[in-house]
């Protein structure tokens, strides 16, 4: 039997656990979108705009391993590109499917709408190429299924965006249905045996000699699916384990060997000391960006650094291209306990102590709030922190085990998290309807992407939306222009947003004191994700987590350097 190419695409996506597709309709993709309704278990999210759709696809992929966004040629796809670039930067697998004009229209170089009027139909495809792992423009129905499979595999395996152009006239053509009976091969190609052996032997020798080793889990630990291996590595070796800001949520923070968040000079002193005095650092999935490293302020005393990456390994100054960390870790786990048996476990840095008791009328401040937040969180929560005070503040919160952390530390596109919350909420609902999705976003950031709350309401999704109202772009005020008009924003009536977007079953709260925070977060009904909630957190204008204040100084200095 045969099925249409459009249906083939959606069946393949369903096979790899992608059940929600993001994007907007446009005349070059409408026929494709018809097919989504023919595939049981698939849904079309229907976003408010393409940028938000890209952010949503990113959030969904961080939870489920990959995602798909569909846009239309030119006007639609270009609106998504900032979001797609963020997914590229941060190693997130998003398949970007673009409905393009028919092959005959392209061949005739017709001056169609949504074109630049110059007959060039490849220009937008070329724009996307630099922020995609691979691209495909389908031109031949015979090879189309294999191209779709290649694009899905590449998206998933490399954890990078992939661009797939589908001409409007091809999606209704038929392909053999039996192709769906063979799963797409998602396996990694094995490492070169000789290189892999050299890597493993070298690591084992370093482990054997180490007196003061540490494990540092970073962004690509979760993005490239080695969280389980890393947890086992900690269990087997008992080495102290730390995370970077981008690694937050990639290891269990209730583990007795968890030591805290390492951000170079911005770390707590005892964390800084523990990591920087180590004689061996096993760095899993490092992504050494400025905000992830305290403006490149790592100051290791040792040269014995092993970097585990998805597509290479680095030991001291030697790089081993093509040696993938997944296999290295799996093989290491069979022998590392023996190599580490001489290690005498040292104490890990103490947890941040609980907040001291203060009068209930004490005005809420960030330092107190982020520390207190850990009491509200539950195992399995998805915690999403917007660029700005939230992304820095969340580093002070100790997560329960199995918490998903989402923030965009490297790309840092303001407003990203509203869309990402939508995507994460879809993903969480598909995994477990009781799984909570909790957003922390500033009043300034929210103004860029607020429309996507409407999509959450449309689908009955129930995230917690904590809006930190500190009257403007606080992170930017701290970096430059504390009193500048360009860092000011129009104040909104945040608690009217949910009904404005048509919510019927919702809650709104305004919290300004420590007592109000505790009363709300300890309320049993508030702890169940039974409805969408907007919580406005009233904060002083220049209030910010201390690590952000320090980072802002470093960033300002970097920006001013000649």
């Amino acid at each position: 039997s045969e099925i249409t190419l459009g249906k083939y695409l959606f069946e393949r996506l369903k096979q790899v656990n992608v059940n929600t597709v993001f994007g907007l309709p446009g005349d070059f993709n409408l026929s494709l979108l018809d097919k989504i309704y023919e595939v049981e278990g698939m849904r079309w999210a229907g976003n408010a705009n393409e940028l938000n759709a890209a952010y949503a696809a990113d959030g969904y992929a961080r939870i489920k391993g990959m995602s798909c966004i569909i846009t239309t040629f030119g006007v639609g796809e270009l609106s998504a590109l900032n979001g797609i670039a963020g997914s590229y930067a941060e190693h997130v697998g998003v398949l970007h499917v673009v409905g393009v004009p028919s092959i005959s229209a392209q061949a005739k170089q017709l001056l169609l709408h949504h074109t630049l009027g110059n007959g060039d139909f490849t220009v937008f495809h070329r724009m996307s190429a630099n922020i995609s792992e691979t691209t495909a423009m389908i031109t031949d129905i015979a090879t189309a299924p294999a191209e779709i499979d290649r694009c899905i595999r590449t998206t998933y395996v490399t954890q990078r965006p992939v661009y797939l152009g589908l001409p409007a006239n091809l999606v209704d053509l038929n392909v053999p249905a039996k192709l769906l009976q063979t799963p797409i091969d998602m396996s990694l190609k094995p490492n070169d045996a000789e290189s892999e052996k050299e890597v493993i032997d070298t690591i084992l020798a370093l482990v054997k000699d180490a007196k003061n080793p540490v494990i540092l889990a970073d962004a690509c630990c979760s993005r490239h699916d080695v969280k389980a291996e890393t947890k086992k590595l900690i269990d087997l070796t008992q080495f102290p384990a730390f995370v970077t800001p981008m690694g937050k949520g990639s290891i269990d923070e209730q583990h007795p060997r968890y030591g805290g968040v390492y951000v170079g000079t911005l770390s707590k002193p005892e964390v800084k000391e523990a990591v920087e005095s180590a004689d061996l650092i096993l760095s899993v999935g490092a992504l050494l960006s400025d905000f992830n490293t305290g403006s490149f302020s790592y100051s290791y005393k040792t040269k014995n650094i092993v970097e585990f990456h998805s597509d290479h390994m680095k030991i001291r100054n030697a790089t081993f291209p093509g040696v993938q960390m997944k296999f290295v870790l799996q093989k290491l786990l069979t022998t590392i306990a023996d190599a580490a048996k001489g290690y005498k476990p040292v104490a890990v840095p103490a947890r941040t102590p609980a907040n001291a008791a203060v009068p209930a009328s004490t005005p809420l401040k960030q330092e107190w709030m982020w520390n207190q937040l850990g009491n509200f969180l539950q195992e399995g929560d998805v915690v999403i922190a917007e660029t700005g005070t939230s992304a820095f503040g969340i580093n002070q919160t100790t997560f329960p085990n199995n918490t998903y952390g989402i923030s965009q530390v490297l790309w840092g596109s303001i407003g990203f998290t509203t869309g990402a919350t939508l995507g994460a909420a879809f993903a969480a609902e598909e995994i477990d309807p009781k799984k909570r999705v909790i957003l922390f976003i500033g009043d300034g950031s929210l103004q860029l992407t607020v429309q996507e709350i409407s999509t959450m309401i449309r689908w009955g999704l129930k995230p917690y939306l904590f809006v930190l109202n500190n009257d403007g772009y606080t992170i930017e005020k701290l970096i430059h222009g504390p009193k500048a008009q360009y860092n000011e924003i129009q104040g909104w009536d945040h608690l009217s947003l949910l009904p404005t977007f048509g919510a019927k079953d919702y809650e709104t709260h305004r919290v300004a004191t420590t007592g109000e925070w505790d009363k709300l977060t300890q309320d049993k009904s508030f702890n169940d994700n039974s409805k969408i909630r907007m919580i406005e957190i009233m904060l002083p204008v220049f209030d910010a987590p201390q690590n952000l204040v320090e980072q802002a100084k470093l960033t300002a200095a970097t920006n001013a350097k000649q």
Partner: nanobody, 120 residues
């Protein structure tokens, strides 16, 4: 981490039916793709069937397609293999297996296996 325990194997006549069950421990069963493999005496272990997280995409080896059905119940952390029209060549140890992500990757976790013997 997930632990897998198979049950339901046994000795049956050719043409009969049998349902294998696999009980999985672990909070996040519904984020694992689930598989059945089998190994006949003196042969390599071979793929039989697999299903994605939601149980709404299923894959089968050509040798069992149309006779075997894989299903899962995420509320009970169970995966099943309904085997109809059994043949002597279906005799093997059947293994339940799980992968943390998608079908199409080598499973991370394996059960101990359950013996199925089909007599002619």
């Amino acid at each position: 981490q997930v632990q897998l325990v198979e049950s339901g194997g046994g000795l049956v006549q050719a043409g009969a039916s049998l349902t294998l069950s696999c009980a999985a421990s672990g909070r996040t069963f519904n984020t694992y793709s689930m598989h059945w493999f089998r190994q006949a005496p003196g042969k390599e272990r071979e793929f039989v069937a697999a299903t994605n997280w939601g149980g709404n995409s299923k894959f089968y080896a050509d040798s069992v397609r149309g006779r075997f059905t894989i299903s899962r119940d995420n509320t009970k952390n169970m995966v099943y293999l309904q085997m109809n029209s059994l043949k002597p060549e279906d005799t093997a140890v059947y293994y339940c297996a799980a992968h943390r992500t998608v079908v199409g990757k080598t499973p991370d976790y394996w059960g101990q296996g359950t013996q199925v013997t089909v007599s002619s």
